[in-house]
């Protein structure tokens, strides 16, 4: 039960995280015009990974796409790449994890296969989350660098006679969405990996140990032996932990094949 819950929760958290990564990637507000200690302009500028927008005081908004590939900063291209890789890995991870879910039966899929798929999706979610966090962090670092550069020469002009308003940009909403989403995907991935450990079938070694007593030959086969670690050589298809306190008799009992839906 606990394994199913962990796996299910990991899937849901990852799903929310990947939806957030997609949303952040598509959002226009990666960087927004800094309004603090600046002349109050009648226009508000903000930029995304794919286009920049200007909102006038009247509400009129105009967005222009970056219709060049080579003319864009390498850092922006890197951020785009990281976010896209994160989305692709996350999407594949979601696809894999759907089939790996313990609550879904697909033919006669072995638990070992489900465990492997859960681990694979978990790793994909972790990498996806890391890609998103890295992408957002690279962009944030770029913003901070540019912010202080533009602060240094807030007003540039010809002998101080004509002043140019330097538009400074600060963190936009997409950065926070990206960080949170990346974190959720990462957490979801970790949960999937944890669930995988619980799904992994235990291999039982039936090694007979013979004790030769005087006049008798008795072979003791430790069929009901349980490994103290919880991950040792248990009986086939045995669930390690179900999250609830149970009697020793319950622990000893074997699950039927119908316990796995």
């Amino acid at each position: 039960m606990a394994v199913t819950a962990c796996q299910g929760l990991g899937f849901v958290v990852s799903l929310i995280g990947i939806a957030g990564i997609i949303a952040a990637t598509c959002m226009d507000q990666w960087s927004t015009q800094d309004l603090y200690n600046n002349p109050v302009t009648a226009v508000f500028n903000y930029q995304g990974l794919w286009r920049s927008c200007v909102r006038e005081s009247s509400g009129f908004t105009e967005c222009r796409g970056y219709f060049t590939l080579l003319g864009l900063p390498a850092m922006l291209q890197a951020v785009r790449a990281l976010m896209i890789v994160g989305i692709v890995l996350g999407a594949i991870g979601l696809l894999v994890s759907i089939f790996a879910l313990k609550c879904i039966r697909i033919g006669s899929m072995e638990d070992s296969a489900k465990a492997n798929m859960t681990l694979t999706s978990g790793i994909m979610f972790i990498v996806s989350g890391l890609c998103a966090i890295a992408g957002v962090s690279v962009f944030a670092n770029m913003l901070v660098t540019n912010f202080w550069m533009s602060t240094a020469n807030m007003y540039t002009g010809m002998g101080g006679m004509v002043q140019t308003v330097q538009t400074r940009y600060t963190f936009g909403a997409a950065l926070f969405v990206g960080w949170v989403a990346g974190g959720l995907t990462l957490i979801g991935g970790v949960m999937m990996c944890i669930a995988c450990r619980g799904l992994a079938p235990e291999e039982t070694n039936y090694k007979a140990v013979s004790y030769h007593a005087s006049g008798h030959s008795v072979a003791y086969k430790p069929g009901g032996f349980k490994a103290s670690t919880g991950f040792g050589s248990n009986t086939k298809n045995k669930k390690i932990y179900d999250g609830g306190a149970r009697t020793e008799d319950e622990v000893q009992s074997y699950p039927s094949k119908h316990d796995y839906v």
Epitope: A42, V43, T167
Partner: antibody, heavy 118, light 113 residues
């Protein structure tokens, strides 16, 4: 067609307040902002403030302490009030519609001529 | 506040003549986000409120004759009337629409010779 009609007093005594109502037709105040501008022989055209479609306002810092702009969308009316008037506030006061783009004023009221005198 | 300086203060012209008037701002009116200049030109005839002619420094308002042309960028702007007509006699104002408070120039008065 778009129209802005102003109503207000022509003569106000010093230290009194000025109230002008700008009644609009041909458009809705829920979609457009309304600016207020005055024109005096000494200072030319001066922007005073604006009330945006959402009800938020921006004022000229020089008038912020004695100026208030409000509106009633249902009545299509914008209310302008300026306190503590002095003779140098004598001017023609205009309301003007904020154009949807360009941050400019595309339609103007006929103007309210104000004289501040005792 | 941004200071808008218009020159000349008055122009005496003959009908059919080409006219140019200048407007300079103390700060750049160019917005880097959309590469648009937030400068507007108005025409005001005696006893009337100002009328919008040109916004974004060079975009003509609908219904404005194409003899009116706005140009310039940053801090220097020009309004050109390719062939002055009698009905063009008025005062022309430029306005900063970029930084609050929005400010106007003192105007250029166009008079007939």
């Amino acid at each position: 067609q778009v129209q802005l009609k102003q109503s207000g007093p022509g003569l106000v005594q010093p230290s009194q307040s000025l109230s002008i109502t700008c009644t609009v037709s041909g458009f809705s105040l829920t979609y457009y902002g309304v600016h207020w501008v005055r024109q005096s022989p000494g200072k030319g055209l001066e922007w005073l403030g604006v009330i945006w479609r959402g009800g938020n306002t921006d004022y000229n810092a020089a008038f912020i302490s004695r100026l208030s702009i409000n509106k009633d969308n249902s009545k299509s009316q914008v209310f302008f009030k300026m306190n503590s008037l002095q003779p140098n506030d004598t001017a023609i006061y205009y309301c003007a519609r904020a154009a949807y783009y360009g941050n400019c004023f595309d339609y103007w009221g006929q103007g309210t001529t104000l004289t501040v005198s005792s | 506040d941004i200071v808008m300086t218009q020159s000349p203060s008055s122009l005496t012209v003959t009908a059919g003549e080409k006219v140019t008037m200048s407007c300079k701002s103390s700060q750049s009116l160019l917005n880097s986000g959309n590469q648009k200049n937030y400068l507007t030109w108005y025409q005001q005839k005696p006893g009337q409120p100002p009328k919008l002619l040109i916004y974004w420094a060079s975009t003509r308002e609908s219904g404005v004759p194409d003899r009116f042309t706005g140009s310039g960028s940053g801090t220097d702007f020009t309004l050109t009337i390719s062939s002055v007509q009698a009905e063009d006699l008025a005062v022309y104002y430029c306005q900063n629409n970029y930084i609050y408070p929005l400010t106007f120039g003192a105007g250029t008065k166009l008079e007939l010779k």
